[in-house]
Interface confidence: medium
């Protein structure tokens, strides 16, 4: 409530940015040249979900792994390629809606 003698005006409800509450960790091999792919995916994700938290970590040889809210959803070591943007964005949509996450199995070769 406001100070005595002042009129309290309820603030408008906070607008929740799309992707708020979803945390992504991308672990990738920098010497392998995977940084460009990470930046490309991170940019696409941020565009769709500005409220998302993305943190990158350096990984071992050949690594390109994506975790959403602590769950591994993509591993280059398992899949051989890189995820499609649309598949990652769909996984984030599911996570932000509280739906069950499934591993991304489709992959594309590096550009």
């Amino acid at each position: 409530s406001g100070e005595p003698g002042q009129t309290s005006v309820a603030p408008p409800p906070e607008e929740v940015e799309p992707g708020s509450g979803v945390r992504i960790v991308v672990e990738y091999c920098e010497p392998c040249g995977f940084e460009a792919t990470y930046l490309e995916l991170a940019s696409a994700v941020k565009e769709q979900y500005p409220g998302i938290e993305i943190e990158s970590r350096l990984g071992g040889t050949g690594a390109f792994e994506i975790e959403i809210n602590g769950q591994l959803v993509f591993s280059k070591l398992e899949n051989g390629g890189f995820p499609y943007e649309k598949d990652l964005i769909e996984a984030i949509r599911r996570a932000s809606n509280g739906e069950t996450l499934e591993k991304i199995t489709n992959s594309r070769p590096p550009c």
Partner: antibody
């Protein structure tokens, strides 16, 4: 060899201020995510906060007990990390360590691999 | 903040023993956990990162395991140099947090 050297510790009265410095050598400092960790006498380690590299946004994060009172900054031209401590309380008495929280190089991957020797801050009237 | 709970607080053992320290996170942190060793008057030193990866130069008698919320550090065949305090630290969250520590002392 990577080296981190803290300075600026000392005795200060409750409510007072102090600025700690941490000079870093042996790495490209501008690429490093730097952290401060403290340890009260006879107690465990407590993470204080962290500043990302400028290329990663240069943003800061703080532990709840120090948020709003402590400010982490960096001067990449001087290879130096700072911790500005205001409104100090007796419970801020501790050894303060600076450390590399993440370094953009394959030789430093996770956690905190390199620490300084620590500088002692005593808050007492 | 993510709370990290270590047990036991103190552990008494003899040279040659095998000991295990556990660390529990208040929520899933995947495998983003590090273990540190600290000796009196010294800065901590990282032993293990990403739950089970041994830091370069750390003896192979140290090993880590776990994922999600439950983690452990095992020291096989304790050496005199291993008596110290051990801490776990999560780095899943932007706000890093440590366990309260486990003091390993000579029985």
């Amino acid at each position: 060899e990577v080296q981190l050297v803290e300075s600026g510790g000392g005795l200060v009265k409750p409510g007072g201020s102090l600025r700690l410095s941490c000079e870093v050598s042996g790495i490209t400092f501008s690429n490093a995510w730097m952290s401060w960790v403290r340890q009260a006498p006879g107690k465990g380690l407590e993470w204080v906060g962290r500043i990302k590299s400028k290329t990663d946004g240069g943003t800061t994060d703080y532990a709840a007990p120090v948020k709003g009172r402590f400010t982490i900054s960096r001067d990449d031209s001087k290879n130096t990390l700072y911790l500005q401590m205001n409104s100090l309380k007796t419970e801020d008495t501790a050894v303060y360590y600076c450390s590399i929280g993440y370094y953009y190089d394959s030789s430093f991957k996770y956690g905190m691999d390199v620490w300084g020797q620590g500088t002692t801050v005593t808050v007492s009237s | 903040d993510i709370q990290m709970t270590q047990s036991p607080a103190t552990l008494s053992a003899s040279v040659g023993d095998r000991v295990t320290i556990t660390c529990r996170a208040s929520q899933s942190i995947s495998r983003w956990l590090a273990w540190y060793q600290q000796k009196p008057g010294q800065a901590p030193k990282v032993l293990i990162y990403k739950a089970s990866t041994l830091q370069s130069g750390v003896p192979s008698r140290f090993s880590g395991s776990g994922s999600g919320t439950e983690f452990s550090l095992t020291i096989n065949s304790l050496q005199p140099d291993d008596f110290a305090t051990y801490y776990c630290q999560q780095y899943y969250s932007y706000l890093r947090t440590f366990g309260q520590g486990t003091k390993l002392e000579i029985k």
